[in-house]
Amino acid sequence: SERCDDWGLDTMRQIQVFEDEPARIKCPLFEHFLKYNYSTAHSSGLTLIWYWTRQDRDLEEPINFRLPENRISKEKDVLWFRPTLLNDTGNYTCMLRNTTYCSKVAFPLEVVQKDSCFNSPMRLPVHRLYIEQGIHNITCPNVDGYFPSSVKPSVTWYKGCTEIVNFHNVQPKGMNLSFFIPLVSNNGNYTCVVTYLENGRLFHLTRTMTVKVVGSPKDAVPPHIYSPNDRVVYEKEPGEELVIPCKVYFSFIMDSHNEIWWTIDGKKPDDVPVDITIIESVSYSSTEDETRTQILSIKKVTPEDLKRNYVCHARNAEGEAEQAAKVKQKVIPPRYTVELACGFGAT
């Protein structure tokens, strides 16, 4: 056969669908790889061919479109499962071709099982709602094209395992779920189950998403440095280990580039002749505020090191902050017995 323009396995689209539910999968060629749509290709005499490779197999095989009740079918550039089975998992290929042209792309399809509380290995989209601010709506996602607009499906919303009925600030209305003044207690996984009738058969579509209530833009502030601060003095003897944490709070700001760093005598730690180790860590609050820590340590501090200026810096999209650490050399009290004895003329 003629050479085919092979786009390989498109791992960016790792499609996951629930077992025993309808699934409609568009050929990615027209969405991401080719500059024309299916209608144009079809009217130019190009044919779309589907085939697949089962999980843990190397053999490409045609898709069986002659299953009972048309369980798998193709409509224009869409591959339909009504419904899916667990063993439909595999790599699917759509190929567009005629006698002189060929282009194809493969993509992974994973059919996953869910339990009665909608728990599954499915990767969940995240919706962020601003805390205590206004009314937020989320819409049951990825249900377009499953049924005609004349069909009015029933929609049931759940938080975790519980159907949303009489929740104090969450209200379902068809495909939408409204949050009135979101609170941290609204964090969790929300599921819509859409039920519709097609050719006398009842189908369910299950869509789960994670809701995270995050800090509001009106609460966005420049970084706040917890440590070092004016109350703590790092008093060390030469030869001891000096450990100073730079611990900074960042309010949640969508996509903010949050950074912390140390300077020593106004220079990068690398530009100072000191053997320094810096270890960084990060933690998040329930509203995705961030606490970053950079621990600066010098194993065996010298008298010169104890005279240097150690400054912790931080910045986010709102502004900057800096704080110097109070470092000093410990004054060693006289060793009483020896020095007193010397004072009395003892040898």
Partner: antibody, heavy 117, light 107 residues
Framework: EVQLLESGGGLVQRGGSLRLSCAAS????????MSWVRQAPGKGLEWVSS????????NYADSVKGRFTISRDNSKNTLHLQMNSLRAEDTAVYYC??????????WGHGTTVTVSS | EIVLTQSPATLSLSPGERATLSCRAS??????LAWYQQKPGQAPRLLIY???NRATGIPARFSGSGSGTDFTLTISSLEPEDFAVYYC?????????FGQGTRLEIK
Amino acid sequence: EVQLLESGGGLVQRGGSLRLSCAASGFTFSSYAMSWVRQAPGKGLEWVSSISGSGDSTNYADSVKGRFTISRDNSKNTLHLQMNSLRAEDTAVYYCVRDYYYGMDVWGHGTTVTVSS
Amino acid sequence: EIVLTQSPATLSLSPGERATLSCRASQSVNSYLAWYQQKPGQAPRLLIYDASNRATGIPARFSGSGSGTDFTLTISSLEPEDFAVYYCQQRSYWPITFGQGTRLEIK
């Protein structure tokens, strides 16, 4: 002397994979965030991915999310970029960059990745 | 994402003249803007950081100004080695973005 040396570039078929590496020397590698920046032939600069000094925080450009993975080995002073499902538009010179808080202050010479169709 | 628009796309000047390059952000990036210089066949080099601070080893003829959305790189008196492509870059929000570049060429 502070230096970054990229390797691993080359010619690859569309849909294929490549792993770029960057050897760092002359500075305390684990103290710095690192990034990859690319430049397609005759085009401008495009940020690809960044990783924090400890390696626990990563960010990606939308154009590579799900296909590329940035990682680092602080014990070997090495930065990596695993590139899967390569496309023609990934053809570029890939620069390994030291990313200090204010800017990308040290750049490697770059390694060329060519994705053929 | 924040879009950085540089102008002009090309600037034709003679050595000794003053060059003014502009970079405009689609939303405020505070003062977290850097400028880079790139010569043919070479990696870029950091010139200016935080809108107005010269990086180590950068000559005093390079200066930067601006904050928020409008930024300027000025080269007070052009030297032959200054003819190159200049990029601005914002570091306020992810993703990090670059401008499309201004080519500074000899008239």
